[in-house]
Amino acid sequence: VPPGEDSKDVAAPHRQPLTSSERIDKQIRYILDGISALRKETCNKSNMCESSKEALAENNLNLPKMAEKDGCFQSGFNEETCLVKIITGLLEFEVYLEYLQNRFESSEEQARAVQMSTKVLIQFLQKKAKNLDAITTPDPTTNASLLTKLQAQNQWLQDMTTHLILRSFKEFLQSSLRALRQM
């Protein structure tokens, strides 16, 4: 169900239209639902979710992660710096979400929904950000070569990469959700 169209909204016709913050919140939760479904398929298909060899594959990936310097943690919280980090991180995740597109059999549509919903989330957040100049967009050429490199990995590494992308994306979204609710 697309965000804003769940049964709760139908059951409360008196409800005001969603605010920008509520829309963003709902969108993140919708994407997290999608990730959850994709992780189920990944974990059922292989033993990657219990694997202790994650570090091997993690070295090849430069997945966005929240750190204290990004202004999203309570200590040193900075709304604008944090918003820039969230948008930049999501833009950096896009190439990895593209990689996921051919990695699922029964959840192919779910993988596409996560990708498209993330694009919408980025648009919502860009409207909220004041300092759009500080947002660096990833280089398309670099992304294309990264995608080629990831797709050329052996089966085991591709399974591990899929697992790591989903796990890291979930964590990044949760950190973002937490920070956005403090704004």
């Epitope: 709760k8 605010t19 509520e22 919140d25 939760r29 997290l32 959850s36 929240m66 943690f73 309570q74 200590s75 796990r167 979930k170 964590e171 949760q174 950190s175 959700l177 937490r178 609710r181 403090q182």
Partner: antibody
Framework: QVTLKESGPTLVKPTQTLTLTCSFS??????????VGWVRQPPGKALEWLAF???????YYSPSLESRLTITKDTSKNQVVLTMTNMDPVDTATYYC??????????????WGQGTLVT | DIQMTQSPSSLSAFVGDGVTMTCWAS??????LNWYHQRPGEAPELLVF???NLQIGVPSRFRGSGSETYFTLTINSLQPEDSGTYFC?????????FGGGTKLEI
């Protein structure tokens, strides 16, 4: 099975520092979405939230007590420690640690320790 | 800070009755509202999270509803073990805040 247990002194003198340890099992504090919080309850009164620590070491404190509180975690030992400086008789309460763990960060405490009464 | 106000502060009812208690938030918290039940001398127990989701193991006679600033907890067909104090909690943002509680006597 998820369990949490608070330990620490039952009696503290005014101006002293209280150190409480929450030892837990059945979950990992390195899993995203997971956090541990401290809540206290003076005798016959309502619950009061004190502090919270997340899987990624982000920490939050009650604004009225922030200057006196420190929360830390030791993921390998499955422990969370709360220290509260400059204790006063009004801090007499049962102190609970509790777990929060869900994808959407509802900050709902689904499992609680038995509590420890500090006087 | 988001203030949470509960009403009534106490109520009494008979076994088999139904009761409703309310919780107000001083600003919109979407559906980030949790309900707890506490018996004397025991730790609180999570009943409802995210305004309307029953925690696993909680009987279906409990029902949470509401959104934004107004929330209710309804208990149908009261049982003796339902006595105690009910607390609502803001789960939207920090600082986390609890309501003052509703004491239920059966």
């Amino acid at each position: 099975q998820v369990t949490l247990k608070e330990s620490g002194p039952t009696l503290v003198k005014p101006t002293q520092t209280l150190t409480l340890t929450c030892s837990f099992s059945g979950f990992s504090l390195s899993t995203s979405g997971v956090g541990v919080g401290w809540v206290r309850q003076p005798p016959g009164k309502a619950l009061e939230w004190l502090a919270f620590i997340f899987w990624d070491d982000d920490k939050y404190y009650s604004p009225s007590l922030e200057s006196r509180l420190t929360i830390t975690k030791d993921t390998s030992k499955n422990q969370v420690v709360l220290t509260m400086t400059n204790m006063d008789p009004v801090d007499t309460a049962t102190y609970y640690c509790a777990r929060s763990a869900d994808d959407y960060l509802y900050y709902s405490f689904d499992t609680w320790g038995q509590g420890t009464l500090v006087t | 800070d988001i203030q949470m106000t509960q009403s009534p502060s106490s109520l009494s009812a008979f076994v088999g009755d139904g009761v409703t208690m309310t919780c107000w938030a001083s600003q919109s918290i979407n559906d980030y509202l949790n309900w707890y039940h506490q018996r004397p001398g025991e730790a609180p127990e999570l009943l409802v999270f995210a305004a309307s989701n029953l925690q696993i193991g909680v009987p279906s006679r409990f029902r949470g509803s509401g959104s934004e600033t107004y929330f209710t907890l309804t208990i149908n067909s009261l049982q003796p073990e339902d006595s105690g104090t009910y607390f609502c909690q803001n789960g939207h943002s920090f600082p986390l805040t609890f309501g003052g509680g509703t004491k239920l006597e059966i």
